[in-house]
């Protein structure tokens, strides 16, 4: 028998520095977790103790904090090189700055293979990107070889900016021939490493003949055997065992997100490359694990530029940006309109001639808007200003909901109106009318939504049984502020870009902004 240790991360999302327990900015260092310096300490400890170790990343290193805003992927290449990752799969967020924003900062700079079998380049890009990412890579590990085959969510064109010269194929269809090729090369130990979410990971384990282990990402899935060490609730045991169609037991793993855990999986193979046993657990990277001093020093060196960036002007406002709780928790506020407009703008993807865009709607809890911005400071808007407005380090995500769920959400928005509570919704691509004289749960008297399958966008009444795409904060997607109906009834959820980054990019693009209060949210009394 031959034993392999797989160390894995996924959905790190720019958390290079240690974070608080909820993966936001570290405040009390003695209680902080994760970060590449701490990760390196643990990885090195395991590398010294065990003979056959692979360090793998399942995608979405890009996007999530000011580190990515400033360094645009150079930080990912640098620190992944420093940690000596063995391979990485491309995630959807790796395309957030377009193909160019992937090629130069990461693909060219990485000293480890970057993989995806189901992304095919065409046109002029094919020769340009040739060899910079691979469908698979055979890695020598001790006296053996291990094949790693990559995959990426085929939804990426809707979630990011891969352009028109990359085709995202069905994962299973694309993986099978690559695995077959590895078999012909006498590689009998094969790991599928990818970024399509836990449901697809399980399907790959079930359907792709010859895959021995699946290491996934995208769905931020936390798996654990035994008593979990922090706040995350396990979605299943680690590893999650799938019985393949050809009768094999295939371990599937994922390691939550944000670099909080290091996935740790031990696999025992027989001489024919069959998995005999698999066991392990994610390792919580808490403060009991010291940060590696040399990596920490490097982090501090790179950190300097981030502080400089925070105070640079992104753009100007010529109007007061009303982000006060007195406004945003009671009525339409222009800060809410600005943020929602930025959220929609960030999700413009012309992927189908029938649609002017795939999504037109935004909802945003008023309680998530934490500060106004005064235009009398020469109109200047900085990252620092936006960090006061959106201090929680969340993301603006894409969900699919039925109209009936949206109706419930808008009823919840005003179910206890007048108490300055955070659930009051700010909107974009939606016209809502409330009648507060009616009883809670029956106060939405008009709800019109902007069409997407149209050449001239216009507002149509919400249809209860129709499925709509909506951009919203991850806080709402996870049922925050009492929006349990969103969490329970959403049909699809894809994590998006860092909230501040979305708004800062929009302001930089617009240069001068003047959002108005324009009748998106109205109140009435009496008949309709």
């Amino acid at each position: 028998a031959w034993e392999l240790t797989i160390l894995h991360t996924n959905d790190v999302h720019s958390r290079l520095e240690q974070t608080s327990e909820d993966s936001s900015k570290c405040v009390n260092a003695s209680r902080c977790m994760g970060g590449v310096a701490r990760l390196f300490t643990k990885v090195q400890q395991i590398r010294r103790a065990e003979p056959n170790v692979l360090l793998l990343d399942a995608g979405d290193q890009y996007q999530g904090t000011i580190w990515f805003t400033v360094y645009k992927g150079a930080e990912v290449a640098h620190f992944m090189n420093a940690l000596r990752y063995d391979a990485m799969a491309l995630g959807n967020h790796e395309f957030d700055n377009g193909v160019e924003g992937l090629i130069e900062p990461l693909l060219k700079e990485a000293k480890f293979p970057i993989l995806s079998a189901n992304i095919k380049a065409k046109g002029p890009l094919a020769s340009q990107i040739s060899g910079l990412y691979l469908p698979y890579k055979v890695l020598p590990v001790g006296d053996e070889v291990v094949g790693i085959v990559g995959y990426t969510s085929k939804e990426t064109p809707f979630l990011s900016n891969p352009g028109t010269n990359l085709v995202f194929e069905d994962e299973i269809t694309a993986l099978q021939p690559e695995v077959d090729k590895l078999k012909t090369l006498n590689v009998n130990k094969i790991i599928a490493l990818g970024h399509s979410g836990f449901e697809m990971d399980k399907l790959i384990a079930q359907k792709v003949r010859g895959v021995d282990v699946v290491v996934g990402g995208h769905s931020n899935t936390f798996l654990y055997t035994g008593n979990p060490p922090s706040k995350e609730v396990p979605a299943g045991k680690y590893p999650f065992i799938v019985t393949s169609d050809d009768g094999r037991k295939v371990p599937v793993v994922q390691a939550y997100a944000f670099g909080k855990y290091l996935g740790y999986l031990k696999i025992e193979f027989d001489e024919r490359g069959n998995v005999i046993s698999s066991h392990g657990n994610p390792i919580l990277l808490n403060s009991s694990i010291p940060e590696d001093p040399s990596i920490k020093a490097d982090i501090n060196k790179w950190r300097i530029k981030l502080d400089n960036y925070s105070t640079q002007e992104l753009g100007k406002t010529i109007v007061y940006l009303d982000g006060s709780s007195q406004s945003c928790r009671f009525r339409e506020c222009n800060m809410g309109n600005l943020i929602c407009d930025a959220m929609i703008n960030n999700n413009l993807r012309h992927t189908d001639e029938m649609f002017w865009n795939h999504v037109s709607m935004c909802i945003l809890n008023g309680g998530g808007i934490r500060s106004p911005i005064d235009e009398r400071n020469n109109g200047t808007i900085t990252w620092e200003n936006l960090a006061a407005v959106l201090p929680f380090g969340g993301t603006f995500d894409l969900v699919q909901l039925k109209g009936s769920t949206l109706k419930k959400a808008f009823e919840h928005s005003v179910h206890r109106y007048g108490q300055s509570t955070g659930e009051f919704l700010q909107v974009g691509g939606i016209h809502v009318v409330y009648d507060l004289s009616r009883k809670p749960g029956d106060r939405v008297v008009k709800l019109d939504v902007l069409c997407t399958k149209c050449r001239v966008p216009s507002y149509d009444p919400l249809k209860m049984d129709e499925v709509y795409k909506v951009i919203l904060p991850n806080f709402l997607a996870n049922g925050g502020d009492g929006f349990q109906m969103i969490k329970d009834e959403l049909l699809r959820h894809d994590s998006g870009d860092q909230d501040i980054n979305v708004v800062s990019t929009y302001i930089s693009k617009m240069k001068v902004i003047y959002p108005a209060v324009e009748g998106r949210i109205k109140f009435s009394t009496g008949s309709h």
């Epitope: 645009k72 150079a74 900062p105 060219k108 020769s127 340009q128 060899g131």
Partner: antibody, heavy 123, light 108 residues
């Protein structure tokens, strides 16, 4: 306006040392890798050495490895080339050049060049 | 190290001509290639990077193409100011930078 001004060139005997300096202005110096490129009279261009923006990646041409040392002082917006054990074949114009993209660990292309300083190694 | 070979070494042409200079790499460099123009007594000037991207301020009569090992610099209609020496340069990942030997473009 980006400006790169080299200094420190001159006539030096074989085996001796010389230190070249390059003063940079008009751009955020500490965001970019910097390089020295040389050109012997009437000959082509030869890359001599490069240093990444954070000084972690330092590279040399085989012809100067072990003899030349590149360094930078980001606080002073300055690039240096310490040249020891000079040989006749090191005679050339030495150009200071700025790398194209910011924050890279490896080297790219040179979008701005200084006017060069002449180093003559002769007895 | 990656060797870069330019051809021809010298090229004679007239104003208005379309001229092409070729650069060949000893191994694949994807499209990590730049072209420079140098006039006597002056520092080189960047024309093209990433094989085909035109540096800002460079006239559109200059264009670059190719990938892998074969690259070309084309001047669509030669102007008096274009008579100079041209160099290609590869910057493949973590390889030492190397230049071609140069192509001197002279008046016919």
């Amino acid at each position: 306006e980006v400006q790169l001004v080299e200094s420190g060139g001159g006539l030096v005997q074989p085996g001796r040392s010389l230190r070249l300096s390059c003063a940079a202005s008009g751009f955020s110096f500490d965001d970019y890798a910097m390089h020295w490129v040389r050109q012997a009279p009437g000959k082509g261009l030869e890359w001599v050495s490069g240093i990444s923006w954070h000084s972690d990646n330092i590279g040399y041409a085989d012809s100067v490895k072990g003899r030349f040392t590149i360094s930078r002082d980001n606080a002073k917006n300055s690039l240096y080339l310490q040249m020891n054990s000079l040989r006749a074949e090191d005679t050339a114009f030495y150009y200071c050049a700025k790398d194209g993209p910011r924050y890279r660990g490896s080297y790219y292309y040179f979008d701005y060049w200084g006017q060069g300083t002449l180093v003559t190694v002769s007895s | 190290d990656i060797q870069m070979t330019q051809s021809p070494s010298t090229l004679s042409a007239s104003v208005g001509d379309r001229v092409t200079i070729t650069c060949r790499a000893s191994q694949s460099i994807s499209n990590w290639l730049a072209w420079y123009q140098q006039k006597p007594g002056k520092a080189p000037k960047l024309l093209i990077y990433k094989a085909s991207s035109l540096e800002s301020g460079v006239p559109s009569r200059f264009s670059g193409s190719g990938s892998g090992t074969e690259f070309t610099l084309t001047i669509s209609s030669l102007q008096p100011d274009d008579f100079a020496t041209y160099y290609c340069q590869q910057y493949n990942s973590y390889s030492p930078i190397t230049f071609g030997q140069g192509t001197r473009l002279e008046i016919k």
